[in-house]
Interface confidence: low
């Protein structure tokens, strides 16, 4: 039988009446155009909706936009366009919402051709009021908030000036010219690249990396011959041109650019790229593109300093620079990542790691699924997940994989079951254990979202025809009920729920089309009456994460510790509630070789946990570049995996001796170091 049609499916009683009483329609008095939606703050219920309509005239485009505000999670909206003086808002800049619960919003307006600068509308009270401010420059990018202080804003101008405001956009000061890329670091530090000669494009590879820690009063050049830079976790990365040729290398700093080390990664040529796939304060996943237009590269995982790298995955699918990769952090379970590889026969296969890139494996075939036509053996195959690449290839995949940190273990994704990703219409699969096992959840492509920390999953069929039905499940996708939310079907455009999966409200967005006009419409459904009572202790059960063999004493040990979670029973129909916090009990494991990565100069042969010397380095002194000096490494080949918390057991010895010799890295020499003040 199809998923969800079993006899024992727990039906929610009287749900139609309960949902009908909690379904709120809002028709926007608008021609269709485009619509964008932003949540303002966390748990505030405030939503801003910007509708934009372009009227193409012979010579120019005339635009009109409207701004709406809801303070009840989208049940009711008020037209507040007059607060922004009926100005046309530039949708390419979106709505710049301030960090945390600052309540700050910046909208960038369209201005007429001859004006001296742009115009913004600013609110610091969750969009109840706006202040119009004329800018002394034309913005090139959306305003960037400092993560530490939402009054500090950063913007690049169309003239490549770097502008800073210290009073939430009231006053602006140009702190540097000829800037290509700028980013906020920690402690209100700004990093940016500048060009000396022609332009950002012409000087690529000859840029300088600068830093200011006092909002532009003084500067320090922290790098030269820069191609690009990036921030990830506590790491600052720069790709730097080599002296002798057109290759470039990654340098890394963990002290805001004061000192740099050369990452033990392959150098790349002009047509290749590096990409930080994921980073936290412990480590980084780095993709290094293969030479030639192969569409793949290698994933490396770093040590705790971002310097020594272990090869994690070969033939990792990542199309040309800025292209598509399926790399996905499964946020519902620690250590889990999913991505795609391009196999020798050019088919695309999905791989999963449960230990932060230590080992990769195929996804287990779902119990209730047959192998498709891509499988050589009809009894042996794997699940393959559709993500960004499939979406970019216009396959019938409306959504990327979904997981939420507070919906422990749940992963939802489109996929196919075979030897590789199939171009046939996919189905939707769910895992409730962080990707170890999978079940077909819904037939055919769907939009889906998680509400109430996993207590409810909502889905809408992906169809070219108008729709009026929503599906929901209160048991992690085992059983589904359908609810007709409107008599008149709408052309569906999106499903919106408050980020963080804490809400019980879902908004269905779409438009109605008649002979004369089309209008935006939203339906917000509150599921609070479906989950009538608050969950109690008896509704939760203990679950050991990463458990694969309960008989094994090491069962659940990942990165040196195991975690037991309290999880909602599938049979419990109750509210986790907005204040729900994941309850977990960690316990430390003893160390084994699995808790160590191979040190510089060592590698792990396949299917072996021991690190052995790289043949080409055998008998050589191990020397590597650290903080601009050459270091001598005495090691028996192991280094603790970043974030690994194991204790006792195996403890390989390693020692680093300073050789007091300078590295050959041309990145920064003392004479290039300079400080400047405005």
């Amino acid at each position: 039988s199809a998923p969800g049609e079993d006899e024992e499916c727990g039906r929610v009683r009287d749900f139609v009446a309960k949902l009908a009483n909690n379904t709120h329609q809002h028709v926007f008095d608008d021609l269709r155009g485009s619509v964008s939606l932003s949540w303002v703050g966390d748990s505030t219920g405030v939503i801003l909706v910007l509708t934009t309509f372009h009227v193409p005239l012979v010579i120019m485009t005339f635009g009109q936009s409207k701004l709406y505000r809801s303070e009840d999670y989208g049940k009711n909206f008020k037209d507040i366009t007059d607060l922004i003086n009926n100005t046309f808002i530039r949708t390419e800049f979106g709505m710049a919402i301030g960090p945390e619960n600052s309540g700050k919003v910046v909208l960038t307006a369209e201005v007429s051709g001859g004006s001296r600068g742009g115009r913004i509308f600013r609110s610091s009270d969750f969009a109840k009021n706006f202040v119009q401010t004329d800018l002394p420059f034309h913005p090139l990018t959306q305003m960037m908030y400092s993560p530490q202080n939402s009054d500090y804003l950063l913007a690049l101008s169309t003239e490549n000036g770097l502008w800073v405001s210290k009073n939430f956009g009231g006053k602006w000061e140009e702190i540097h010219k000829a800037v290509c890329l700028a980013k906020w670091g920690s402690d209100n530090t700004i990093f940016f690249t500048t060009y000396a000669n022609g332009s950002c494009k012409a000087d690529l590879g000859a840029l300088e990396l600068w830093r200011t820690s006092d909002l532009g009063k003084s500067f320090k050049t922290i790098g030269v011959k820069i191609y690009s830079f990036g921030l990830g976790g506590r790491f600052l990365f720069a790709s730097v041109m080599a002296d002798k040729d057109t290759t470039r290398r990654i340098h890394v700093s963990t002290d805001q650019g004061d000192t740099w080390s050369m990452a033990q990664l392959p150098s790349v040529g002009q047509e290749q790229f590096y990409s930080i796939l994921a980073a936290n304060d412990d480590m980084v996943f780095m993709h290094v593109d293969e030479p030639g237009d192969t569409g793949f590269g290698t994933i490396f995982t770093s040590d705790d300093r971002g310097i020594v790298y272990s090869k994690s995955l070969d033939r990792h699918l990542y199309t040309t620079t800025g292209g598509e990769t399926d790399f996905t952090n499964v946020t519902s379970l620690r250590g889990v990542y999913i991505t795609s590889v391009l196999s020798e026969d050019n088919s695309i296969q999905t791989m999963i790691t449960f230990d932060q890139g230590g080992r990769w494996t195929h996804l287990r075939k779902p119990e209730n699924s047959e192998c498709d036509a891509t499988a050589k053996n009809k009894n042996e195959c794997s699940l393959h997940i559709h993500a960004s690449y499939s979406i970019s290839q216009k396959l019938n995949v409306p959504m990327a994989p979904l997981s939420e940190p507070n919906a422990v273990g749940i992963v939802i994704a489109h996929g196919s079951v075979g030897d590789a990703i199939s171009v046939m219409v996919p189905d939707v699969y769910i895992s409730d254990d962080g990707g170890y096992s999978w079940t077909k959840m819904l037939e055919g492509p769907h939009y889906y979202t998680i509400l109430d920390a996993g207590g409810i999953i909502v889905a809408i069929e992906h169809s070219s025809r108008p729709i009026n039905v929503i599906k929901f499940s209160t048991d992690e996708g085992q059983c589904w009920q359908t609810y007709t939310f409107t008599r008149d079907p709408i052309y569906f455009t999106g499903l919106a729920s408050e980020p963080g999966a804490r809400s019980m409200n879902i908004s269905i967005w779409g438009f109605t089309e008649s002979f004369l006009t089309s209008q935006w419409v939203s339906y917000t459904i509150d599921f609070k009456d479906i989950l009538e009572r608050n969950c109690e202790e008896k509704d939760y059960t203990i679950w050991l994460a990463h458990s694969t063999d309960p008989e094994d004493y090491e069962d659940g040990c990942i990165l040196g510790y195991k975690e037991q979670f309290l999880r909602l029973r599938k049979s419990s129909v109750c509210q986790n509630g907005r204040d729900y916090v994941v309850t977990k009990q960690p316990s430390i494991c003893l160390c084994s070789l699995e808790d160590f990565l191979c040190d510089f100069g060592y590698y792990r042969p396949e299917n072996d946990s021991k690190c052995v010397e790289q043949p080409e380095l055998k008998g050589h002194d191990l020397e590597f570049c650290l903080y601009g000096r050459e270091e001598h490494l005495t090691t028996n080949g192991y280094r603790k995996i970043p974030g690994d918390k194991c204790q006792g057991g195996v403890n390989p010895v390693r020692e680093v001796k300073d050789l007091k010799k300078k590295c050959t890295s041309n990145f920064l020499s003392p004479e290039k170091q300079n400080s400047k003040s405005n």
Epitope: S587, I588, C589, L593, K610, G637, Q647, V650, P652, V653
Partner: antibody
Framework: QVQLVQSGAEVKKPGASVKVSCKAS????????MSWVRQAPGQGLEWMGI????????SYAQKFQGRVTMTRDTSTSTVYMELSSLRSEDTAVYYC??????????????????????WGQGTTVTVSS | EIVMTQSPATLSVSPGERATLSCRAS??????LAWYQQKPGQAPRLLIY???TRATGIPARFSGSGSGTEFTLTISSLQSEDFAVYYC?????????FGGGTKVEIK
């Protein structure tokens, strides 16, 4: 020979802090973890936490979390245990003990416990008003 | 955390006799268990590690056995210097935990 020498006895008032040192000699300091164990008068042994001398990473028993800090100084091969917000029930003998870590990882990926094989002589901490 | 329970709390044995001490874990600790001896006014001393391996310099009359949740320390023929308190300790999962101790006294 391998030995751990701890600092002398301390008398402290409630609410104060105490910092006990443990100097290691006779082996490579960074090759073994160090645990701290305490024993109240007439009571059993109670594990407080562990420190890895290589990176200084620590793990504390939940009971002492927020009150205990373990540090190390590799230049003097010394580990320290500081306990703050002292109460009368913290009156005990505090021991440092060289913790397992096994042999250097040459063997298979075994998870084998070698026991706390070397102990300090103990430091008596008395908390009294 | 894993709770270690030792029995009996006190064991009265005559010199030359056999003493059997028991230690039970609330969940499996595999063979990650150690036994210690402590005499009044002294620091504990490691006797057995890995549940059954004698530490350096420990006489053959001390032996350990067991795996999982049930462990035994046996002293085949008690000598006068063996009268002391004995503790078991697990290192399977942090936090490390000790049993409450068994006091072996002269009968």
């Amino acid at each position: 020979q391998v030995q751990l020498v701890q600092s002398g006895a301390e008398v402290k008032k409630p609410g104060a802090s105490v910092k006990v040192s443990c100097k290691a000699s006779g082996y490579t300091f960074t090759s073994r973890y160090m645990s701290w164990v305490r024993q109240a008068p007439g009571q059993g042994l109670e594990w407080m936490g562990i420190i890895n001398p290589v990176g200084g990473s620590t793990s504390y028993a939940q009971k002492f979390q927020g009150r205990v800090t373990m540090t190390r100084d590799t230049s003097t091969s010394t580990v320290y245990m500081e306990l703050s917000s002292l109460r009368s029930e913290d009156t005990a003998v505090y021991y440092c003990a060289r913790d397992p870590s096994g042999i250097a990882a040459a063997g298979p990926a075994s998870r084998y416990y070698y026991g706390m094989d070397v102990w300090g002589q103990g430091t008596t901490v008395t908390v009294s008003s | 955390e894993i709770v270690m329970t030792q029995s009996p709390a006190t064991l009265s044995v005559s010199p030359g006799e056999r003493a059997t001490l028991s230690c039970r874990a609330s969940q499996s600790v595999s063979s990650n268990l150690a036994w210690y001896q402590q005499k009044p006014g002294q620091a504990p001393r490691l006797l057995i590690y890995g549940a059954s391996t004698r530490a350096t310099g420990i006489p053959a009359r001390f032996s350990g056995s067991g795996s999982g949740t049930e462990f035994t320390l046996t002293i085949s023929s008690l000598q006068s210097e063996d009268f002391a308190v004995y503790y078991c300790q697990q290192a399977r999962l942090g936090p490390w935990t000790f049993g409450g101790g068994t006091k072996v006294e002269i009968k």
